[in-house]
């Protein structure tokens, strides 16, 4: 008799999901030397502890300490770029601009971007049917709380001038309920960070507004003025410039200093 | 070193036409997006046009649109700035400008010598 | 299009401190770049992105843009600094300030 099993509203965990960390991890490890010592075994039985055999409503930060502890990397605090909505772009960026670092260019980042996973209560099972849905179901799903996790440490890390790409074209800019607006606005460190710098980038060339006196922008400045760290805005207008940088990265043209 | 020079101004009739020529040297010209600026005499710079890398886009400032028709040749290394239904407001020394800055800002870090336009019956 | 305001001319003792103000409506939501130009001769960029100068400009050379001002600011102003000063932004195109012309008393 089949045993019963929940089903989320939310998609199941990714197809080969282990043998993706895995991969991923020892990918990670062969290109970037300074994390040439992490064991991919030991992260991936650490990933899968956060979350085998646990409710995937009742995850918590703590479920993921073993898996951060051996994923502490270092990367430089006043090169770190935040994004919200508009991860490609922000992405394409740092692929470019290899001095800059987003959440996506860590370990952990890198190890569960795009992926999707859960348990069940009792089993050692995972889940390739359905996950539980942030709105729909809960919000102390493995998922969401590996992101609010990881975000949460990233923000805490950086100093000086952190910069975050904001998408222009949405019709909230700054979208509060965001793993931006809700995690990592609040986790900067006023001690450590003197400015956050946003950049707004717009849909073309042709938009000349001014996106930096949007109502969303106003309401972060205050959220960050609030907490004792300066606020600034940029309009970024090519995007265009974005991607042929992306196509042609080696191009002289690519490697503008910000 | 990067090297822009300019050449095609001379003395032209209201209503006439000009085409002038940029020839580049001493970077990847098909790398970079391109511009005119020009100066009236005795006055300020004025943005004329723009043209992306491999030519695909072009812009304009609102004061040429419909006269002026930016171009470029990549094998040739070389810009075109094609001037028509010249006005004596056209009278300036026209700069061809290399666009710098790839992804947050833009600048001209390059500038040619400039070429004159005279613009006068 | 934004437009961008600067003093006609600025007067400045040799050794002494300039600074060329490019005012416009918020001003500082844009990047500015500033471009020296003597008589004759085509414009060179001194300041890009606010406050970065290319390879080869003396360090004297510094600028800032905050509020409704981006401000071009040379310490220890030298007689071959007396030239045109001009600021330029970007908001889908390609916007330069009138010309501050810098005398070195």
């Known amino acids: 008799v089949p045993r019963w099993r929940q089903q989320w509203s939310g998609p199941g965990t990714t197809k080969r999901f282990p043998e993706t960390v895995l991969a991923r991890c020892v990918k990670y490890t062969e290109i970037h030397p300074e994390m040439r010592h992490v064991d991919c075994q030991s992260v991936w039985d650490a990933f899968k502890g956060a979350f085998i055999s646990k409710h995937p409503c009742n995850i918590t930060e703590e479920d993921y300490q073993p898996l951060m502890k051996l994923g502490t990397q270092t990367v430089p605090c006043n090169k770190i770029l935040l994004w919200s909505r508009i991860k490609d772009l922000a992405h394409q960026f740092t692929q470019v601009q290899r001095d800059m670092f987003t959440l996506e260019d860590t370990l952990l980042g890198y190890l569960a971007d795009d992926l999707t996973w859960c348990g069940e209560f009792n089993t050692s099972k995972i889940n390739y049917q359905s996950c539980p849905d942030w709105r729909k179901d809960c919000s102390n799903n493995p998922v969401s709380v590996f992101w609010k996790t990881v975000s949460r440490r990233f923000a805490e890390a950086a100093c000086d001038v952190v910069h975050v790409m904001l998408n222009g074209s949405r019709s909230k800019i700054f979208d509060k309920n965001s793993t931006f607006g809700s995690v990592e606005v609040h986790n900067l460190q006023p001690e450590k960070v003197q400015t956050l710098e946003a950049w707004v980038i717009h849909g073309g060339r042709e938009d000349s507004r001014d996106l930096c006196q949007d109502p969303t922008i106003k309401e972060l400045e205050s959220i960050i003025s609030k907490r004792n760290i300066q606020f600034s805005c940029k309009n970024i207008y090519r995007p265009d410039k974005f991607l042929q940088c992306v196509k042609n990265p080696e191009d002289s043209s690519c490697t503008s200093e910000i | 070193q990067v090297q822009l020079v300019e050449s095609g101004g001379g003395l032209v009739q209201p209503g006439g036409s000009l085409r002038l020529s940029c020839a580049a040297s001493?970077?990847?010209?098909?790398?970079?997006?391109m511009n005119w600026v020009r100066q009236a005499p005795g006055k300020g710079l004025e943005w004329v046009s723009g043209?992306?890398?491999?030519?695909?886009?072009?812009y304009y400032a609102d004061s040429v649109k419909g006269r002026f028709t930016i171009s470029r040749d990549n094998s040739k290394n070389t810009l075109y700035l094609q001037m028509n239904s010249l006005r004596a407001e056209d009278t300036a020394v026209y700069y061809c400008a290399r666009e710098d800055g790839s992804y947050m800002t833009d600048y001209f870090a390059y500038w040619g010598q400039g070429t004159l336009v005279t613009v006068s019956s | 299009d934004i437009e961008l305001t600067q003093p006609p001319s600025v007067s400045v003792a040799p050794g002494q401190t300039a600074r060329i103000s490019c005012s416009g409506d918020n001003i500082g939501h844009y990047y500015v770049s500033w471009y020296q130009q003597k008589p004759g001769q085509a414009p060179v960029l001194v300041i890009y992105s606010d406050s970065n100068r290319p390879s080869g400009i003396p360090e004297r050379f510094s600028g800032s843009n905050s509020g409704n001002t981006a401000t071009l600011t040379i310490s220890g102003t030298q007689a071959e600094d007396e030239a045109d000063y001009y600021c330029?932004?970007?908001?889908?195109?390609?916007?330069f300030g009138g010309g501050t012309k810098l005398t070195v008393l």
């Open positions: 043209i992306s890398s491999w030519g695909s886009s072009t």
């Open positions: 001493g970077f990847t010209f098909s790398s970079y997006a």
């Open positions: 330029q932004s970007y908001n889908g195109t390609y916007v």
